[in-house]
Interface confidence: medium
Amino acid sequence: AVDLTLLANLRLTDPQRFFLTCVSGEAGAGRGSDAWGPPLLLEKDDRIVRTPPGPPLRLARNGSHQVTLRGFSKPSDLVGVFSCVGGAGARRTRVIYVHNSPGAHLLPDKVTHTVNKGDTAVLSARVHKEKQTDVIWKSNGSYFYTLDWHEAQDGRFLLQLPNVQPPSSGIYSATYLEASPLGSAFFRLIVRGCGAGRWGPGCTKECPGCLHGGVCHDHDGECVCPPGFTGTRCEQACREGRFGQSCQEQCPGISGCRGLTFCLPDPYGCSCGSGWRGSQCQEACAPGHFGADCRLQCQCQNGGTCDRFSGCVCPSGWHGVHCEKSDRIPQILNMASELEFNLETMPRINCAAAGNPFPVRGSIELRKPDGTVLLSTKAIVEPEKTTAEFEVPRLVLADSGFWECRVSTSGGQDSRRFKVNVKVPPVPLAAPRLLTKQSRQLVVSPLVSFSGDGPISTVRLHYRPQDSTMDWSTIVVDPSENVTLMNLRPKTGYSVRVQLSRPGEGGEGAWGPPTLMTTDCPEPLLQPWLEGWHVEGTDRLRVSWSLPLVPGPLVGDGFLLRLWDGTRGQERRENVSSPQARTALLTGLTPGTHYQLDVQLYHCTLLGPASPPAHVLLPPSGPPAPRHLHAQALSDSEIQLTWKHPEALPGPISKYVVEVQVAGGAGDPLWIDVDRPEETSTIIRGLNASTRYLFRMRASIQGLGDWSNTVEESTLGNGLQAEGPVQESRAAEEGLDQ
């Protein structure tokens, strides 16, 4: 059964001090991740016992194994059903506590009734405050039965339930007509799915014979032990004030378990702790009684004394529940009540015994659940005991269940049953998840859901390059942390798999499914530098750069040029997609702007170091284009250009620039300055005869303006070859401004 206990503090003088605590002894309880088990839940269940709404209750988690409910403001907040849910998957279990008001009209003689299938259950509601009206019995919130007030017997209303079946289980209540339901007596009936002493699907299996008030679970045959007892058959008492399947928990407060109600998984239900009784678990056991609710009688023999927490304390030379067994009778010593092994392992099990005559190797045997008897392979004989060692054949799932160690001598015999749990090593159901990647490392989340049994003790990550036959590399990691695989090859696919292990020999599970994870490109390491740049207009910039010379191939796919306009807070990025490029023309820039410029090499999505930055000032934008440009041939070597000044000038024109190009020619155009800005005509001389020319012009103020329209004109024929075109007035003094 799941190790889950719901504790109710019944010191009810002040409801604000009342609390409910749910404690789990399960491994990995309450961690809250799907892979490692859902959290503990503790809540009031208003589906059956409806009470007027009050302020919300406060839930506090104390670590992963404990949750406490507080915030009760008035006694009526306490009345009703509370439940705690814990355990994972198929082991998810609900523990229920039913709280009755101490001031109710009717009080249950006993709150929890655990009965076997086919038994007669009798619920008894004691009259605490009499009303001369009918009593309504309800089952799970629905009308069930009515009793006339005259039908009370010895101040009790009885509800007899003959031949009960598992569906009869639930919350029962007895309420006077015309009385608040808070004054009801509330009961919990638990009907085991089998008759007395039986368990299993067809109720064919025999229960282990639970001691000290333990109840045999009808599904798995385990004893659900009362608080304060442990062992396969609840044969062992915990120290005073301790509870839990392994006595690992301690009652809070200085008065130990006084005033606490303990609720355990069905079919146990609720009781006081060992050594206590009464409706509020505040009364110590009467002499001769012990255990939960003081339900057990000591009946100690041979001078044994009764301890209200553990039962008979035997004098030297005697043992047994009632000190009825002489120490001459052989006795199994210190046998663990529960052992856990992994599937397909071949464990060694030890069984120690003492007695007079002294047990020898052949007198100790081990019996499996299927009845197979194993004989010990060796025995260690010590002065006070003989320890037999058994080599168990390879375990299968059917070996789960109750094993028995038996010792027989002429002095008598003893046997001890213990539970063997065969656990299935965990196998991941999914591949690990890639979180981030770099050129030489992958960050992986190993946390995956799994089949088989937990808890997970280690997680191994196996990895190797895809399609490789080399050995797998392995890294052991913490289950709850992400893993970084280091020193990998760039731009390489890796097959990655998870392997989970649980505690114990043979706890390693099979490898999970593989997944492909690919490392990133190597980072480019070369730092370019800017060779130079020049302005090719108010919005155009030509940039050139170089790279250091290094042996081997260039690691890079291209270059990224960045222009930062600090005034506007804007960045312009230009991608040059050839790693061989060393120059680029940047267009569409903002005239008159101060830019910071740098260049860096890129590879895949990774950027190398940026060049030292350069600072570039683009000239401001120039004036509009001249209007109505017209060309007229004057001779075989002269053409006259006429135009009109641009409109809406921002300032006085400093000069005009004329561009001359032979139509259809492949050479660069020639630029000629017209330095008298007031002129609206000029003659271009030194042209070739019978040649077609293209002309356009622009004005300059602080910067060059827009080009005018292009005009065509041919020189007249039969002239000699000229030396080249010049402008009329300054031909002798100025060359061509190219």
Epitope: T146, L147, E178
Partner: antibody, heavy 128, light 108 residues
Framework: EVQLLESGGGLVQPGGSLRLSCAAS????????MVWVRQAPGKGLEWVSS????????RYADSVKGRFTISRDNSKNTLYLQMNSLRAEDTAVYYC?????????????????????WGQGTMVTVSS | DIQMTQSPATLSLSPGERATLSCRAS???????LAWYQQKPGQAPRLLIY???SRATGIPDRFSGSGSGTEFTLTISSLQSEDFGVYYC?????????FGQGTKVEIK
Amino acid sequence: EVQLLESGGGLVQPGGSLRLSCAASGFTFSSYRMVWVRQAPGKGLEWVSSIYPSGGPTRYADSVKGRFTISRDNSKNTLYLQMNSLRAEDTAVYYCARWSYYYDSSGYYPVSGPFDIWGQGTMVTVSS
Amino acid sequence: DIQMTQSPATLSLSPGERATLSCRASQSVSSSYLAWYQQKPGQAPRLLIYGASSRATGIPDRFSGSGSGTEFTLTISSLQSEDFGVYYCQQYKDWPRTFGQGTKVEIK
């Protein structure tokens, strides 16, 4: 379907006896209180007797006390009314009915209820 | 015993009209303990209203009950042809359980 079916009525002489039966179906008979109510020809309704699920506590109208006995057999889902020392004024249609309970308007307090399910009735005539 | 008195003895109305039936108790009856029944000729009574104002299962909402203490009323907001018959009030606070003498609602 919830149903009650009376039988056993008939003509009987004054001083005679008659046993009425009421067969219940469609609900858990053994859980409910039951009553007999009668209606003399052309008259109103008169409660006669009531019984609790256990068969224990019973109540009677003053007019029939000592002469009539109500009983039940939960294993047969049947209610009975044994009528002795019959008089002419006992002539009536006898109805069996289920006696319910419900919650008051707050939804928290259970309250004794009316007679929510009735049989079709059986006629008893006492005449010489 | 608590005496229950109904008025009027007979109420003659046409379909579609509103019917108001009264019931008076000889001593105070909490509203939680008053019921109304309908009975048609040759049939068993049928529970209409319990707790003075709560409609029983399957009863149309044209039937409504009100009142407390000693004065109670059953109202049928718009009479249908199937609503004609005798209506009884009943107290179930004390023993013996007592009924009114009935109000007959007939077609005008």
